[in-house]
Amino acid sequence: MKVLQEPACVSDYMSISTCEWKMGGPTNCSAELRLLYQLVFQSSETHTCVPENNGGVGCVCHLLMDDVVSMDNYTLDLWAGQQLLWKGSFKPSEHVKPRAPGNLTVHTNVSDTVLLTWSNPYPPDNYLYNDLTYAVNIWSENDPAYSRIHNVTYLKPTLRIPASTLKSGISYRARVRAWAQHYNTTWSEWSPSTKWYNSYREPFEQR
């Protein structure tokens, strides 16, 4: 049994780090492998993560962690029974992938404006809470050529779009993702998309 692609881990800077790797051949990850992790800290104990399959040769493990601080460093040991396949370390603060924003909602009852709101995925006491900026992707299912990214660089999780900039009488979808500039994170996954119908019509005089 051999590791083809070493574990690569990212932290959500809250309570979970996700490690993914590839094996040299088809593997029943949960039955054959264990990822042991331990915080380098006084009197810490070793904890075990049971991996799941992620494709034929891929494995993924979700490591439960405490709130992340910059000093935290973990040792990682990948075992197949009594055989140590790989040994490494992981500093969560240096490999952050934020949680995806949630509760994306479209409000079309605001005059001349489409208002999109979503929720910050972190509680106020988390360091990332006040550091997230967002990208909102809006596209049309009726017009494949239409796709826009709106960068939201302010803290408030809202975006206002003049309804007149969207075609009337067709459906649109939106999704949002986040990143934290000061923590040099990757982008989060996209939120689930939400759909709405743009029924806005310009006043008669402007037609």
Epitope: F41, Q42, E45, V69, M71
Partner: antibody
């Protein structure tokens, strides 16, 4: 009531051995790291050894490394310190103390918040 | 090893007056914001040490509020707002960031 009671101290000749015990009660013993601290006559406090809650990690002062062994039996709620190759400078009152919660991912620290009454070890010929 | 240096080593105080003991670590004891791994202990004559303050400024259960801890990084202070006769004994700071845990030399507080 949370309590630690040491035993096993006594008079021993240089080169001899002693085994100290520390019985814990009133708390979930296995979830806590435990620590031994000693105090030579008329001197200050000196850390000796610590052990994680599951016994997998042990730590020793340089002055006792290779001679002392810390262990625990969580089924008996008891901490041990096996002292071999004793020297005159090991003469001290030995205290066990309740240390941090070590079963959490990052151990939670509340100080050495419970101490035993101490047991006296005298090494003399 | 982290060296803990306490001062003063002797502290005569009049009852009702404040008292202050300082402790300096040879390296930072700050692990993360608000978590300085330094404790203060009092050992009364013929007794086991008792915890007063942990993590730099958190008062242990049952400790009178006249005791307070402050400081961050390498410099820490134990303050007693109004010394009482029962406060006499040796006071020790201790770092618990990493083994070997190390204690200060001890400060003997006595009543004038």
């Amino acid at each position: 009531e949370v309590q630690l009671v040491e035993s096993g101290g006594g008079l021993e000749q240089p080169g001899g051995s002693l085994r100290l015990s520390c019985a814990g009660s009133g708390f979930t013993f296995r979830t806590y790291a435990m620590t031994w601290v000693r105090q030579a006559p008329g001197k200050g406090l000196e850390w000796v050894s610590s052990i994680s809650g599951d016994g997998s990690n042990t730590y020793y002062a340089d002055s006792v490394k290779g001679r002392f062994t810390i262990s625990r039996d969580n089924s008996k709620n008891t901490l041990y310190l096996q002292m071999n190759s004793l020297r005159a400078e090991d003469t001290a009152v030995y205290y066990c103390a309740k240390d941090r919660v070590s079963i959490t991912i990052r151990p939670r620290y509340y100080g050495l918040d419970v101490w035993g009454q101490g047991t006296t070890v005298t090494v003399s010929s | 090893d982290i060296v803990m240096t306490q001062s003063p080593l002797s502290l005569p105080v009049t009852p009702g007056e404040p008292a202050s003991i300082s402790c300096t670590a040879s390296q930072s004891l700050l692990y993360s914001i608000g978590y300085n791994y330094v404790d203060w202990y009092l050992q009364k004559s013929g007794q086991s040490p008792q915890l007063l303050i942990y993590l730099g400024n958190k008062r242990a259960s049952g400790v009178p509020d006249r005791f307070s801890g402050s400081g961050s990084g390498t410099d820490f202070t134990l303050k007693i707002s109004r010394v009482e006769a029962e406060d006499v004994g040796f006071y020790y700071c201790m770092q618990a960031l990493t083994t070997p845990y190390t204690f200060g030399q001890g400060t003997k507080l006595e009543i004038k």
